[in-house]
Interface confidence: low
């Protein structure tokens, strides 16, 4: 099984114990590590952070001791903007320039492949996204001709039904991608006006979302039925939680909220908590399991957080094994307890290790 793990370059800027550099990563934990994110400037793939090249080096030296480890560079992301991607992909010349720039950049910096994180193609971009993937793969095949190992090509896809329908020709893009990471999280957010888990495995009777599509099981099943081969589908598991501020004395699933939860001490983003911040939060909190959805949430005062723990990730891994998927994807290593100092287990990366162990279990 693949264990595809994202590392985010901006995690270096978190304060104190929240700061994470690639040299803190465990070289034997994941089969693939994806560095997020690269930029595109003047139609060429480019660095994003001022010290990206240094960080690329740190990451890729992990392969010295584990030659089986593969590293990929992810291009795009939330801050990149869908419009910029759209302009490049829809223009033949821009697309060709971008595609041509990728292999030398990856080779120079020691990466084994590219991950496309176009978040998200619009309805009119669907065909262009397919073309981009098809042409990128063709370039990788051609570039590898002189006996080099072919560069890998993957994509991170939304798990939302509406986005899947409008953005992706699943059957076609699956032919050209080496694997697909399906982002089976962020199904529920503060915009709904109620509490709800952002990454349920199944749609439990408790689910307050207005449809039957907002769960991992549905998204995976939908992708499979739209033509994604199980052997290429990698299921996303979050090492972060989504939090809410309760608006009343109700604390269950579907309770009214006044907005996102208060920012974490290190991640400093309202409505999001890293797993290591959740471990802190759990001291003195009340933990509940949403039985049908097979995930936990915790409440303390007027704060509510839905998250994944070692038990829920094991359930998710069992599920992906039952569906014969290619493996699991983790967003993100730097949101797990990467130092092993927060969650009281004396273990670095407790969630990702639980996923790894569950994948290895017979």
């Amino acid at each position: 099984y693949k264990l595809v793990c994202y590392y985010t370059s901006w995690s270096q800027y978190r304060e104190g114990d929240g700061s994470c550099f690639p040299d803190a990563l465990d070289r034997f934990l994941c089969t693939h590590i994806i560095y997020s994110f690269a930029n595109i400037s003047n139609d060429h793939i480019d660095t994003w952070e001022w010290n990206d090249v240094t960080l690329y080096g740190m990451l890729n030296t992990l392969k010295n001791r584990n030659p089986n480890l593969k590293t990929l560079l992810s291009v795009g992301g939330w801050n990149f903007g869908s419009q910029r991607f759209s302009k490049i992909a829809s223009n033949t010349q821009s697309r060709r320039t971008f595609i041509k720039s990728v292999p030398p950049f990856l080779r120079t910096h020691g990466f084994d492949g590219l991950d496309l994180a176009w978040l998200y193609p619009g309805r009119r971009d669907k065909q262009h996204f397919t073309t981009l993937i098809k042409e990128m793969k063709a370039e990788f095949i051609k570039e590898a001709q002189p006996g080099k190992k072919q560069l890998l090509l993957s994509a991170a896809l939304s798990a939302g039904k509406v986005t899947i329908d409008s953005s992706y020709d699943i059957a076609k893009i699956s032919q050209h991608l080496d694997f697909i990471s399906i982002m089976t999280y962020d199904f529920h957010g503060a915009w709904r006006g109620t509490t709800g888990h952002h990454s349920p495995l199944f749609r439990g009777q408790e689910d307050a979302s207005p449809d039957r599509f907002s769960n991992t099981d549905y998204a995976v099943g939908y992708m499979l039925r739209l033509g994604a081969p199980a052997s290429k589908l990698v299921m996303g598991i979050p090492t972060f939680g989504r939090s809410f501020t309760l608006a009343s004395s109700e604390t269950g699933v579907g309770a009214p909220i006044s907005g996102p939860g208060i920012p974490g001490r290190f991640t400093k983003e309202a409505g999001t908590l890293a797993y290591y911040e959740i471990c802190d939060f759990l001291r003195g909190a009340t933990v509940h399991r949403i039985l049908g959805q097979q995930v936990p949430y915790a409440t303390k005062g007027n704060q509510w957080v839905g998250y994944d723990d070692q038990e829920s990730v094991k359930s998710k891994v069992q599920y992906l094994k039952d569906r014969q998927l290619a493996g699991a994807m983790v967003w993100a290593l730097d949101l797990d307890d990467f130092q092993g100092s927060f969650c009281g287990q004396d273990l670095r990366f407790p969630l990702t290790n639980a996923i790894k162990d569950a994948l290895a279990a017979t």
């Epitope: 199944f202 749609r203 009777q205 307050a208 599509f213 939908y222 039925r225 739209l226 049908g292």
Partner: antibody
Framework: QSVKESGGDLVKPGASLTLTCTAS?????????ICWVRQAPGKGLEWIAC????????TYYASWAKGRFTISKTSSTTVTLQMTSLTAADTATYFC????????????????WGPGTLVTVSS | AIKMTQTPASVEVAVGGTVTIKCQAS??????LAWYQQKPGQPPKLLIY???DLASGVPSRFRGSGSGTQFTLTISGVECADAATYYC????????????FGGGTKVVVE
């Protein structure tokens, strides 16, 4: 391919009854949802419950049916509806029906129906 | 909870005529609406799904339209065989609903 309901009977108020839906020519795989719908004499259709045959955890009930009705997948070709504390208002023809989705993501539509089984609750 | 309201409850139409049945959802259901036909002593039959797509084997005189909260079933060139009760059904969600079906419209062909 067909489905057929069985188990309908004349029972007294307060009694319990289990109806069975049996598939022929196909099995209840992950591609299907199976639902129960009832129709009181001379009245309209009333949805009771559905189960995702591929994930038996996924059961959904009409708000009025929760607690008194239980839908279960009992084998690869049978789904049951257990009914408790029956009253005269539960007198109806009970239909079992299969969701039409060949591809997941279409709405929840029922394109394969059984002939129905009559449940009469009377003292 | 989504509530489906169907109008009229009953309608008479001459052979060859046109009949229009309306269905209103209490909140948006996108295009996830189906129409069924039911004749006495028989189970319902799926006619239209996704608001406007004809189910297999359904004649083209049946036409569905609408999205969001307002939907219409139109039967043109009505035949005697079309005498039945017609139900709309929202297929958007089965969470926290009392009934997915509308109340029904009885079509009497003269």
């Amino acid at each position: 391919q067909s489905v057929k309901e069985s188990g309908g009977d004349l029972v007294k108020p307060g009694a319990s009854l289990t109806l069975t839906c049996t598939a022929s020519g196909f099995s209840f795989s992950s591609s299907y949802w199976i639902c129960w719908v009832r129709q009181a004499p001379g009245k309209g259709l009333e949805w009771i419950a559905c189960i995702d045959a591929g994930s038996s955890e996924s059961t959904y009930y009409a708000s009025w049916a929760k607690g008194r009705f239980t839908i279960s997948k009992t084998s690869s070709t049978t789904v049951t509806l257990q009914m408790t504390s029956l009253t005269a208002a539960d007198t109806a023809t009970y239909f079992c029906a299969r969701d039409s989705r060949v591809v997941a993501g279409v709405g929840m539509y029922l394109n394969l129906w059984g002939p129905g089984t009559l449940v009469t609750v009377s003292s | 909870a989504i509530k489906m309201t169907q109008t009229p409850a009953s309608v008479e139409v001459a052979v060859g005529g046109t009949v229009t049945i309306k269905c209103q959802a209490s909140q948006s259901i996108g295009i996830y609406l189906a129409w069924y036909q039911q004749k006495p002593g028989q189970p319902p039959k799926l006619l239209i799904y996704d608001a406007s797509d004809l189910a297999s084997g359904v004649p083209s005189r049946f036409r569905g339209s609408g999205s969001g909260t307002q939907f219409t079933l139109t039967i043109s060139g009505v035949e005697c065989a079309d005498a039945a009760t017609y139900y709309c059904q929202q297929g958007d969600t089965i969470y926290n609903v009392d009934n997915t079906f509308g109340g029904g419209t009885k079509v009497v062909v003269e």
